[in-house]
């Protein structure tokens, strides 16, 4: 599941990693755009082994993965779901 959140919270990420995570290990991705209390874009990845990590938005692999997910979400495929949540 790929989610884009617009929140008024401060930055969530303490440290960002650029280490590649295979898609089969990923359960959910959350994108927090910059602004609203945090000066940078944040990408949070939930892994299937019940761990959670912040990924460097500049990492090539996450950019490619998000592009694939965006394309799929705009097609007729039922999964993964692209959720735009605006409180």
């Amino acid at each position: 599941v790929l989610e884009v959140y617009y929140t008024s919270l401060r930055c969530r990420c303490v440290q960002e990693s650029s280490v590649f995570i295979p898609r089969r290990f990923i359960d959910r991705i959350q994108i927090l755009p910059r602004g609203n209390g945090c000066p940078r874009k944040e990408i949070i990845v939930w892994k299937k082994n019940k761990s959670i990590v912040c990924v460097d938005p500049q990492a090539e692999w996450i950019q490619r993965m998000m592009e694939v997910l965006r394309k799929r979400s705009s097609s007729t495929l039922p999964v993964p779901v692209f959720k735009r949540k605006i409180p």
Partner: antibody
Framework: QVTLKESGPGILQPSQTLSLTCSFS??????????VGWIRQPSGKGLEWLAN???????YYNPSLINRLTISKNTSNNQAFLKITNVDAPDTATYYC??????????????WGQGIMVTVSS | DIQMTQSPSSLSASLGDRITITCQAS??????LIWFQQKPGKSPWPVIY???NLASGVPSRFSGSRSGSHYSLTISSLESEDMADYHC?????????FGSGTKLEIK
Amino acid sequence: QVTLKESGPGILQPSQTLSLTCSFSGFSLSTYGMGVGWIRQPSGKGLEWLANIWWDDDKYYNPSLINRLTISKNTSNNQAFLKITNVDAPDTATYYCARSELVMPYVPFDFWGQGIMVTVSS
Amino acid sequence: DIQMTQSPSSLSASLGDRITITCQASQDIGIDLIWFQQKPGKSPWPVIYYTANLASGVPSRFSGSRSGSHYSLTISSLESEDMADYHCLQYKQYPFTFGSGTKLEIK
């Protein structure tokens, strides 16, 4: 307000099965990212992680005790359970349940129960 | 399993002292370390998370740091309410493992 409370027998005999219940409020184990763990502490000693159960029924155990541990949950009753088979004197300890929420920043065991003292004695 | 070697096991210090407690990890755990405070007869409570971040409501005299595989909890000016046991926990990978604990007493 998040609260957790452990319940179970205060005393049991060697070779018996210890059954503990964690009753909680202020969160739900049906919510994505929520988990409950069990930790124990022999009197005057350090903490030992035993097991975790997550919203999706994923379970993790301490390998040193995995053959004796079973963790489970009843989501609708807001309860988590731990069973330890074939108990012996070294299992005498205070047993805690604690909440974990898989959010960023991730702080496992951010809320704890008051603990329950369990004594194994013949 | 990752072993967490905590020292000292006990520590006696005076009010106003600066004290440091250390945990050494047997494998790389990055910043995935928490310090818990446990007051007598009470349950543990997080004071530092992700190695160096102050948990909500914790006084600023508490701080955490890392040097290689060594992780430290420092109290800059000891107060009587800091008398407690302190435990480190690594949560980089299962099984989660705690240090053996440090009992902090006031002289």
